[in-house]
Interface confidence: medium
């Protein structure tokens, strides 16, 4: 299965509410493995 | 306010080991994902490792040219991460930077230390 | 390893003119690529992330775009402290890799 920061990150999230690829949470902090570095 | 502060750079001979350390405030470090980047004199940025959250088991990755001999850790006790290098090269000489990023709320952030030195010489 | 190309590698322009710089990756990465500027004895500074999202605080001159393989970072109109080196970088895969770097220099 995908390991990359991208694929964790979207499992992480769990619901995505993607913009350019970002994912969004407005409660806790969600690690964005790729999108930001 | 978000600070990164390395330590423990500095010159030692090949074949030498060194630790650095990152120190972190101003938000909760268990939290997040954070990188060691490294700049060659002169050259361009590296990405050298990269360990996951405290909830991610904090999880390693390195780059190719480091494996083996470099290793990544966090005490989050201390709010602090780390980087072992063992074996060092001539090629390890760089500053190398803590990088830290993640998602808080609708705004992605990206902070970076403002480096430590590490020279590898006879 | 995905390898990025920045060109040109230095690109001599005036205050005012319109500066257009290239990272192409030699695999697919989607949109997972930032844009860094870097000044000597600074740290790197984020631009763009997502391939065309521009980070906080950064001024709308700046400008990313594409997608897949090939990507773009634009300043419309060049201000003299804009001049400095840029660095693409993608985080579609490990190991996450930056370009060599675009040395944009006054004319």
């Known amino acids: 299965s995908c390991n990359t920061a991208t694929c964790v990150t979207h499992r992480l999230a769990g619901l995505l509410s993607r913009s350019g690829g970002v994912v969004k949470d407005n409660f806790v902090p969600t690690n964005v493995g790729s999108e930001a570095f | 306010e978000v600070q990164l502060v390395e330590s423990g750079g500095g010159l030692v001979q090949p074949g030498g080991s060194l630790r650095l350390s990152c120190a972190a405030s101003g938000f909760t470090f268990s939290n997040y994902w954070i990188s060691w980047v490294r700049q060659a004199p002169g050259k361009g940025l590296e990405w050298v490792a990269e360990i996951r959250s405290e909830s991610d088991a904090s999880a390693t990755h390195y780059a190719e040219a480091v494996k083996g001999r470099f290793t990544i850790s966090r005490d989050n006790a201390k709010n602090s991460l780390y980087l072992q290098m063992n074996s060092l090269r001539a090629e390890d000489t760089a500053v190398y930077y803590c990088?830290?990023?993640?998602?808080?709320?609708?705004?992605?952030?990206?902070?970076w230390g403002q480096g430590t030195l590490v020279t590898v010489s006879s | 390893e995905i390898v990025l190309t920045q060109s040109p590698a230095t690109l001599s322009l005036s205050p005012g003119e319109r500066a257009t710089l290239s990272c192409k990756a030699s695999k697919r990465v989607t949109t997972y690529v930032s844009w860094y500027q870097q000044k000597p004895g600074q740290a790197p500074r984020l631009l763009i992330y997502g391939a065309s999202n521009r980070y906080l605080g950064i001024p709308a001159r700046f400008s990313g775009s594409g997608s897949g393989t090939d990507f773009t970072l634009t300043i419309s109109s060049l201000e003299p402290e804009d001049f400095a080196v840029y660095y693409c970088s993608q985080s579609y895969n490990y190991p996450y890799t930056f370009g060599q770097g675009t040395k944009l220099e006054i004319k």
């Open positions: 990088l830290l990023y993640f998602d808080y709320g609708l705004a992605i952030q990206n902070y």
